[in-house]
């Protein structure tokens, strides 16, 4: 070996100075008599080496690196050898920090593995090999006096937890526990825990199960779940409190917590849930009233709440067939009475013949919102119910009676916007209980089966805004019927558009006769079109060669017009504008020339 490096310390605080010396022996005869010693840290040459020849002929270079900012680097002592750098010796330098105090030390007792598992947070990176040791001792009191030491627990590399096996534990007796961290720059110790392993016991959760329905037990109410749990047997003798959490499977709802529940409850009816909804449930327990850790949440149990019978009001309306008055078409609409009114599976219309107690004849069972049935001759009334698996809604009686009530007056309709119509009326005297408003396409597309209807429960109402199934440029027939206690009034109807279309084109102008100063024009009116409002008037426009314009307004029934006061032998451009309340449109332009003064009139 020609050279040898010695350093003040191979491991230092990051950023601290370090001093190194390199001595080259005299017997390295192949070297220059006065070799220049160079220093290199990693790949970089380092200036500042102070070189001297010692009395024994050896060469020494000393360098001080003011700040070692590399966590690991090689320091080399070199000589120039021809064109290359020859390394004579090198040392590994390391820099870092002493270990921080480990914090958040906590332990839990696992009764299944019979071990105390402690974990901690090691603190910031030291950049140096750092060992952690979990140290503990047995103590009779509150850990002020140290009893038998327990064998150190050394975690596997990189782990921040360690298990003290049962043979080193004393249950129901305190233990002092702390973590010691050590590296080349120092040692640190966490604050000491003083604990009885049983006070940090973490139990296994019970297993949730659905309760087997017993024949004598009442089924759960709507929005309720019956469940039970099987405690973790090895923890059965430990007093515990438990809590249940649940949430609907669908949607973004967060967990709702129920508790505390005694472990021994073993079975439980959970209510106040949404009916007919699938729920996810979990349970966990903790030793209580003595200290302990919460168990993990149990595996999920998925259960569905029973549904509730529909809680709806059924608004009804009916029509008789004109050809067969005993054939009735009944319509209805469910109106929820509560926020959660229950699922509707279907509807049943039934009739109970008088004198036949209990005998109910179903007239129809449907999922639709209407049905047609033959009304038995003696039937004046039927009952309508909505049903699901949990039961039926309260029956709605439907009475078929003659129209004996007074009629409403001054029925009128007006457009609000292209998709709504306002229908208004003057209420009759006495006030009705309410009104049925029906609407659908007017002629020629009218159809009884395609009508929309609504019930207005307020008998004092003087109008109703129709917002459903209204489209522009369509003629609607609107029928309003007042409803009384046991009868109804005669129906009234009105026709209206929510938005009318301007005429699509004006009639073509034709020249019938022409003279020197006049011209007779005629046209064939456009046939009326559905969705287009009737014409209100025509305007005829004519312009001479000097670009002077003239016009005349004609009523909508006009079929022709004579232009007077024209100049002879002059050119005129004429067009007709057809107008309605919805707008106007122009015909094509007719160009004509009046006759010369010497010419004869043309008829």
């Amino acid at each position: 070996e020609c050279g040898h490096i010695s350093v003040s310390a191979p491991i230092v605080h990051l950023g601290d100075p370090i001093t190194a010396s390199c001595i080259i022996k005299q017997n390295c005869s192949h070297l220059d008599p006065e070799p220049q010693i160079l220093w290199r840290l990693g790949a970089e040459l380092q200036p500042g080496g102070r070189q001297q020849r010692l009395s024994d002929g050896t060469q020494e270079s000393i360098i001080t690196l003011p700040h070692l900012n590399h966590t690991q680097a090689f320091l080399s002592c070199c000589l120039n050898w021809g064109n290359s750098l020859q390394i004579l010796d090198q040392v590994e330098l390391r820099a870092g920090y002493p270990p921080a105090i480990p914090h958040n030390l906590s332990c839990l007792m696992n009764l299944t593995t019979s071990s105390l598992i402690c974990q901690w947070e090691p603190g910031p990176e030291t950049h140096l090999p750092t060992s952690f040791t979990l140290k503990s001792f047995k103590s009779r009191g509150n850990c002020q006096t140290q009893g038998d030491s327990i064998l150190d627990c050394v975690p596997k590399d990189g782990q921040s937890h360690c298990c003290i096996p049962r043979k080193h534990l004393l249950l129901y007796q305190n233990m002092g526990i702390w973590v010691q961290a050590e590296n080349a720059l120092g040692t640190s110790m966490s604050p000491q825990l003083c604990l009885d392993p049983m006070d940090v016991v973490k139990l296994e959760p019970p297993m949730l199960r659905t309760m087997d329905p017993s024949p004598e037990a009442a089924p759960p109410q709507a929005g309720c779940l019956q469940l039970c749990w099987e405690p973790w047997q090895p923890g059965l003798h430990i007093n515990q409190k438990c809590e249940l959490r649940h949430k609907p499977q669908r949607g973004e709802a967060s967990w709702a917590l129920v508790g505390p529940l005694p472990l021994e409850a073993l079975q439980y009816e959970l209510c106040g849930l949404l009916p007919a909804t699938a729920y996810t449930l979990q349970i966990r327990c903790i030793r209580w009233p003595l200290p302990g850790h919460w168990s993990d949440w149990s595996p999920s149990l998925e259960l569905r709440t029973t549904e509730r019978a529909p809680t709806v009001r059924l608004d009804t309306w009916w029509r008789q067939r004109q050809l067969d008055p005993r054939t009735v078409q009944l319509f209805w609409k469910p109106v929820p009475l509560e926020e959660d009114s229950g699922r509707i599976q279907g509807y049943v219309v039934s009739w109970r013949p008088s004198g036949q107690a209990g005998a109910i004849l179903p007239l129809c069972n449907t999922t639709e919102l209407s049905c047609t049935f033959h009304l038995p001759s003696e039937a004046q009334e039927v009952a309508l119910v909505a049903y699901n698996s949990a039961g039926t809604s309260r029956p709605t009686p439907v009475v078929f009676s003659e129209s004996r009530g007074p009629a409403l007056t001054r029925l009128h309709a007006m457009a609000r916007d292209p998709h709504s119509l306002w229908v208004g009326w003057e209420p009759p005297n006495p006030w009705p209980q309410g009104y049925v408003i029906e609407w659908g396409l007017g002629p020629p597309s009218a159809s009884n089966s395609n009508k929309t209807w609504r019930m207005e429960q307020n008998g004092r109402a003087t109008g109703f805004l129709l917002k459903e199934n209204i489209r522009p440029f369509q003629l609607y027939e609107i029928i309003v019927t007042p409803l009384y206690q046991d009868t109804m009034g005669p129906s009234q109807h009105v026709y209206a558009y929510s938005q009318e279309m301007a005429p699509s084109h004006a009639p073509e102008l034709h020249l019938k006769h022409i003279g020197k100063t006049w011209a007779q024009l005629e046209w064939v009116p456009e046939p009326p079109e559905l969705g287009k409002s009737p014409l209100t008037h025509y305007t005829i426009f004519w312009t001479n060669a000097q670009n002077q314009s003239f016009s005349a307004i004609l009523n909508a029934s006009s079929r022709g017009f004579v232009l007077h006061g024209l100049e002879p032998a002059s050119l005129y451009h004429i067009h007709l504008m057809a107008a309605s309340q919805a707008g106007a449109t122009n015909s094509t332009v007719l160009t004509l020339m009046t006759l010369t003064p010497e010419g004869s009139e043309l008829h």
Epitope: L111, K167, L171, E264, L266, R287
Partner: antibody, heavy 118, light 107 residues
Framework: EVQLLESGGGLVQPGGSLRLSCAAS????????MGWVRQAPGKGLEWVSS????????PYADSVKGRFTISRDNSKNTLYLQMNSLRAEDTAVYYC???????????WGQGTLVTVSS | DIQMTQSPSSLSASVGDRVTITCRAS??????LNWYQQKPGKAPKLLIY???NLQNGVPSRFSGSGSGTDFTLTISSLQPEDFATYYC?????????FGGGTKVEIK
């Protein structure tokens, strides 16, 4: 000091009934599971039944299931064992015991002898 | 059900001897094993719970070990007052079973 005092033992004919009692003192009775263990003459120990601190959980040995009922009155610090349809093989010293959190019988009463014989 | 097999059923030993009694469970019971001592005409007394924990007031010559299915009670130096019958009991799952007992007699 924990004390458990059994009473109610005695001679009974097969098919008869007896009710054993165990008066507890020296600890918070309502916080602990309690149990009955029996020992037939010259034989080993046999677990009979246990009862949870509030009385909601009551496991039984198969040999007594349906005939014996364990109960407790936390207000009186007393444990009971109602024994019906007694058989000759139920003859034993019946011990009342306080259970620990890990299922160990921490303290035992002195026992009461039940003899089933015609 | 978890059955408990204790061996030997009896043994003779002298004062000062080291005595070992074993107990085997028919299936794993973690550390849920307890040891009791019973003297004639007396109620049993808890010695060791949870396999290796010495009950308060029990001399330290008694120790327990094992886990899973195989367990041992050791008396390091037998004393005159230790001649008795010893029982093991599992408390992992109901029904609880006791071992058949080991009678320790004076040689």
């Amino acid at each position: 000091e924990v004390q458990l005092l059994e009473s109610g033992g005695g001679l009974v004919q097969p098919g008869g009934s007896l009710r054993l009692s165990c008066a507890a003192s020296g600890f918070t009775f309502s916080l602990y599971w309690m149990g009955w263990v029996r020992q037939a003459p010259g034989k080993g120990l046999e677990w009979v039944s246990s009862i949870s601190s509030s009385g909601g959980v009551t496991p039984y040995a198969d040999s007594v299931k349906g005939r014996f009922t364990i109960s407790r009155d936390n207000s009186k610090n007393t444990l009971y064992l109602q024994m019906n349809s007694l058989r000759a093989e139920d003859t034993a010293v019946y011990y009342c015991a306080k259970l620990g959190e890990l299922g160990q019988y921490m303290f035992w009463g002195q026992g009461t002898l039940v003899t089933v014989s015609s | 059900d978890i059955q408990m097999t204790q061996s030997p059923s009896s043994l003779s030993a002298s004062v000062g001897d080291r005595v070992t009694i074993t107990c085997r469970a028919s299936q794993g019971i973690s550390s849920y094993l307890n040891w009791y001592q019973q003297k004639p005409g007396k109620a049993p007394k808890l010695l060791i719970y949870y396999a290796s924990n010495l009950q308060n007031g029990v001399p330290s010559r008694f120790s327990g070990s094992g886990s899973g299915t195989d367990f041992t009670l050791t008396i390091s130096s037998l004393q005159p007052e230790d001649f008795a019958t010893y029982y093991c009991q599992q408390s992992f799952y109901y029904p609880f079973y006791f071992g058949g007992g080991t009678k320790v007699e004076i040689k």
